[in-house]
Interface confidence: low
């Protein structure tokens, strides 16, 4: 049974009388086949499910898909699938839906082999209505909503060709051929890469990166010798090939392509990667891969301009380009994030840091496990936390961590306490301050989801049998109390509730199964009757964030400012409600040289909060590349932390100067950089 | 010797804003933060906010929140509050003082508090209809 | 915002006697708590600062103790210059906070 299970649980009186009344069951008129999900809009209630089912015949596949429509949170549903014609939706394109709350949805429908082009759906009123449009070319991705303007969509065509519509989807237009990425940029600009010869494959590395900002009617090549470009934050990033050999470099913007500058990243060569792991509008945290199949590489941590790159972390697990990482950003708590290392010997721990990739420790030990069999000494452990990582190795986790933004210090996540991840069974485990504790929540695997910010978490028990009980929690997963949602058990595909955390609705969706036939089902349950009223200020309490020493004037001191929070008591059943915006109170900090890091030339060592200079670099003018000028950098070692808002205190002095000379490494400086029109 | 010295009485009219100066000398205008604090007649001190002179950085009290606007001018060593809006319960004598919270003793983890060292004479704002 | 209370409101004592003032927090300020000084029509003075520590030029009969969320300001001997308003002041948390003041008054 679940920790907490016991007679000391505040329990929630009628609950069954309340759960039962606001349960609501559909089923679907359809065969198994596969089910898709989306949720159209914010607090709009509305959701669209599409049902695919193939039928495998001797010569081809004939497929039958089916679109509802629910507006009360998945209650009740809709067939409105004539509103598409009836027609066969291609799933592998899911439903694209329009940013923000534009109401926005297309739908891309599968056509028979010999049509000129592919066909879609549009709406633009939340799904009541579509209107059918034949595309003029066949599509190779989903269409791409420009996040400034729903109306403007893009789409790269199986022949390459990069697509653009102004009018969400009813006219559109080839802007260029030859295009192997393109991505939206801030204020409608189009970033794009191009081939010269074969193709996007024969040509990597000899690519060019073009950028269009009135969306078509004219050009700029803003790199060459461009291997995959990325957009992270306010930072463009490219790969660009070196002159001399096969090695590769990180190349870095932040007026849109215009200036570059070199990133002081270590090249890579071609069995080689780099990723953006994480990136604001203050920075970057980039992986660069080890040489050879190792599994690992090098965590790096970047200053302002995504140019100077501290090493935060080595031996970080990621398996292959485009493979696995357990880099997760923890939401719920400022500067959090957690990931996995592959030790010495193989097995593979837990890291977490609270400032941003400052500092890397392992997980706490939750007070109430036992060290496990991995572990060498019993007393002595850390908690490790399975992510994407481990549901690829198909061990038994049915979801990755889970932190919401709105939900502050609550972190849930599967785990096993010892010297390393374990390939027994996990259990699932929660933090209430963001990472620094932890407790053993639920024995065994679950699905886990947090609503009404918070307010309640929802957990449903990873079975291969067919299931009928949910679990809930209304004191952030200390006590759990279940519910019996049908008499009729149903096998159990996914929990579904609105993004964002604010709703007090989930759905349990499953398939039915007897002798003739296989269903869709699903259960929507309103918890709205078991918050019965809405949070006062009685019901909320201040809370330090990053508190480890409530006697140190520096107490909760992280990137420069500490935060007070106001957070709901663990005692209180009421309802945050949907308009819940969380309270807080910064307050600066004083800087330390903690609020530094190591300037280019500079670096710290182990366990110093000093920079010194770099050996090689001693008695040298310390010259660096900035956007394709020499620069001459007189510093004292440190550089403000991205986001670091301290005042005071420690200041150290730093300086640059234009030594007026160009070093554009092999990249079109902007004296070079042509414009075309169309 | 070290010294703030502050502008003049002021009369207001409700709804209107006033902007208090504060100059400073004796010592490194940029080494120390500056807090302005108030007190209306017959009460107690009550702080407003405080300026890093360095950058100009501020943190105000949530009361002040969206009223009051303080800054600085290097060149001249003097930081100024400007507080909008008024109203007759901002009747008050408003004083900045050197906030020595720009002082970190040695070692990254010690933090230590030296007080509101030195106080200007403090400026009267009277806000009347 | 952390609340500073203050205790009592007027402490009415005869010079030569020994004043003692509370100040209590209502979280822990640790020892970030300054003691200031009050008379009329003149602005405050700082008396003590880190709970203990007397400031520049404070003769030795004042003296703070106390730390976490309870403060006390002892006057051993107070003298006619003594009689004023005094505050306390943490510095732990932004905002800033003060006391509600003691106004210590010739008995």
């Known amino acids: 049974s679940a920790p907490g299970e016991d007679e000391e649980c505040g329990r929630v009186r009628d609950f069954v009388a309340k759960l039962a009344n606001n349960t609501h069951q559909h089923v679907f008129d359809d065969l198994r086949g596969s089910v898709s999900l989306s949720w159209v809009g914010d607090s709009t209630g509305v959701i669209l499910v599409l049902t695919t089912f193939h039928v495998p015949l001797v010569i081809m596949t004939f497929g039958q898909s089916k679109l509802y429509r629910s507006e009360d949170y998945g209650k009740n549903f809709k067939d409105i699938t004539d509103l598409i014609n009836n027609t066969f939706i291609r799933t592998e394109f899911g439903m694209a839906i329009g940013p923000e709350n534009s109401g926005k949805v297309v739908l891309t429908a599968e056509v028979s082999g010999g049509s000129r082009g592919g066909r879609i759906f549009r709406s633009s009123d939340f799904a009541k209505n579509f209107v059918q449009t034949d595309l003029p070319f066949h599509p190779l991705t989903q269409m791409m909503y420009s996040p400034q303007n729903s109306d403007y969509l893009l789409a790269l065509s199986t022949e390459n060709g990069l697509w653009v519509s102004k009018n969400f989807g009813g006219k559109w237009e080839e802007i260029h051929k030859a295009v192997c990425l393109a991505k939206w940029g801030s204020d409608n600009t189009i970033f794009f890469t191009t081939y010269a010869n074969g193709s996007c494959k024969a040509d990597l590395g000899a690519l060019e990166l073009w950028r269009t900002s009135d969306l078509g009617k004219s050009f700029k090549t803003i790199g060459v010798k461009i291997y995959s470009f990325g957009l992270g934050g306010r930072f463009l990033f490219a790969s660009v090939m070196a002159d001399k050999d096969t090695t590769r470099r990180i190349h870095v913007s932040t007026d849109q392509g215009d200036t570059w500058s070199m990133a002081q990243l270590p090249s890579v060569g071609q069995e080689q990667f780099y990723s953006i792991l994480a990136a604001n509008d203050d920075m970057v945290f980039m992986h660069v891969d080890e040489p050879g199949d190792t599994g690992f590489g090098t965590i790096f941590t970047s200053d302002d301009r995504g140019i100077v790159y501290s090493k935060s972390l080595d031996r970080h697990l990621y398996t292959t380009t485009g493979g696995e990482t357990d880099f997760t950003n923890v939401t719920s708590l400022r500067g959090v994030y957690i990931t996995s290392v592959l030790s010495e010997d193989n097995s593979i721990q837990t890291m977490i840091t609270f400032d941003q990739g400052g500092r890397w420790t392992h997980l706490r030990k939750p007070e109430n496990s036992e060290c496990d069999a991995t572990a060498k000494n019993k007393n002595e452990c850390s908690l490790h936390i399975h992510a994407s990582y481990s549901i690829s190795q198909k061990l038994n986790v049915p979801m990755a961590p889970l932190s919401e933004p709105n939900a502050v210090g609550i972190v849930i996540a599967h785990g096993s306490v010892g010297d390393a991840i374990s390939v027994m069974v996990p259990d699932v485990y929660i933090s209430d301050d963001g990472g620094y504790s932890w407790t053993k929540m639920l024995e065994g695997p679950h699905y886990y989801t947090i609503l009404d910010s918070g307010g309640i978490i929802v957990a449903i028990e990873h079975s291969s049998r067919p299931i009928n009980v949910i679990k809930f929690s209304t004191d952030e997963g200390q006590c759990w109390q279940t519910y019996t949602f049908t008499r009729d058990p149903i096998y159990f595909t996914g929990l579904a509730s609105e993004p964002g955390a604010r709703s007090m609705n989930i759905s349990i969706w499953g398939f039915t199964e007897s002798a003739l036939t296989s269903q869709w089902v699903s259960y929507t349950i309103d918890f709205k009757d078991i918050l019965e009223r809405n949070c006062e200020e009685k019901d909320y309490t201040i809370w330090l964030a990053h508190s480890t020493d409530p006697e140190d004037y520096e107490d909760g001191c992280i990137l420069g400012y500490k935060e007070q929070f106001l957070r709901l008591r663990k005692s209180s059943v009421c309802q945050n409600g949907r308009d819940y915006v969380v309270t807080k109170q910064p307050s600066i900090c004083l800087c330390s040289l903690e609020d530094f890091l190591c300037d280019f030339g500079y670096y710290r060592p182990e366990n110093d909060s000093k920079c010194v200079e770099q050996p090689e670099l001693k008695g040298h003018d310390l010259e660096f590349c900035l956007y394709g000028r020499e620069e001459h950098l007189t510093t004292n070692g440190y550089r403000k932390i991205p986001g670091d808002k301290c005042q005071g205190g420690v200041n150290p002095v730093r300086e640059v100067k234009d030594l007026k000379k160009k070093c554009t490494s092999n990249f079109l400086s902007p004296e070079k950089q042509n414009s075309k029109s169309n | 010797q070290v010294q703030l010295v502050q502008s003049g009485a002021e009369v207001k009219k409700p709804g209107a804003s006033v902007k208090v100066s504060c100059k400073a000398s004796?010592?490194?205008?940029?080494?120390?933060?500056m807090s302005w604090v108030r007190q209306a007649p017959g009460q107690g001190l009550e702080w407003m906010g405080i300026i890093n002179p360095v950058g100009g950085s501020t943190s105000y009290a949530q009361k002040f929140q969206g009223r009051v606007t303080m800054t600085r001018d290097t060149s001249t060593s003097t930081v100024y509050m400007e507080l909008s809006s008024l109203r007759s319960e901002d009747t008050a004598v408003y004083y900045c003082?050197?906030?020595?919270?720009?002082?970190?003793?040695?070692?990254?983890?010690?933090?230590?508090?030296?007080?509101?060292?030195?106080w200007g004479q403090g400026t009267t704002v009277t806000v009347s209809s | 915002e952390i609340v500073m209370t203050q205790s009592p409101a007027t402490l009415s004592v005869s010079p030569g006697e020994r004043a003692t003032l509370s100040c209590r927090a209502s979280q822990s300020v640790s020892s970030n708590l300054a003691w200031y000084q009050q008379k009329p029509g003149q602005a405050p003075r700082l008396l003590i600062y880190g709970a203990s520590t007397r400031a520049t030029g404070i003769p030795a009969r004042f003296s703070g103790s106390g730390s976490g969320t309870e403060f006390t300001l002892t006057i051993s001997s107070l003298q006619s210059e003594d009689f004023a308003v005094y505050y306390c002041q943490q510095a732990r948390l932004g905002p800033w906070t003060f006391g509600g003041g003691t106004k210590v008054e010739i008995k």
């Open positions: 003082a050197r906030d020595p919270s720009g002082i970190a003793a040695a070692g990254p983890a010690s933090r230590y508090y030296y007080g509101m060292d030195v």
């Open positions: 004796g010592y490194t205008f940029t080494s120390r933060y």
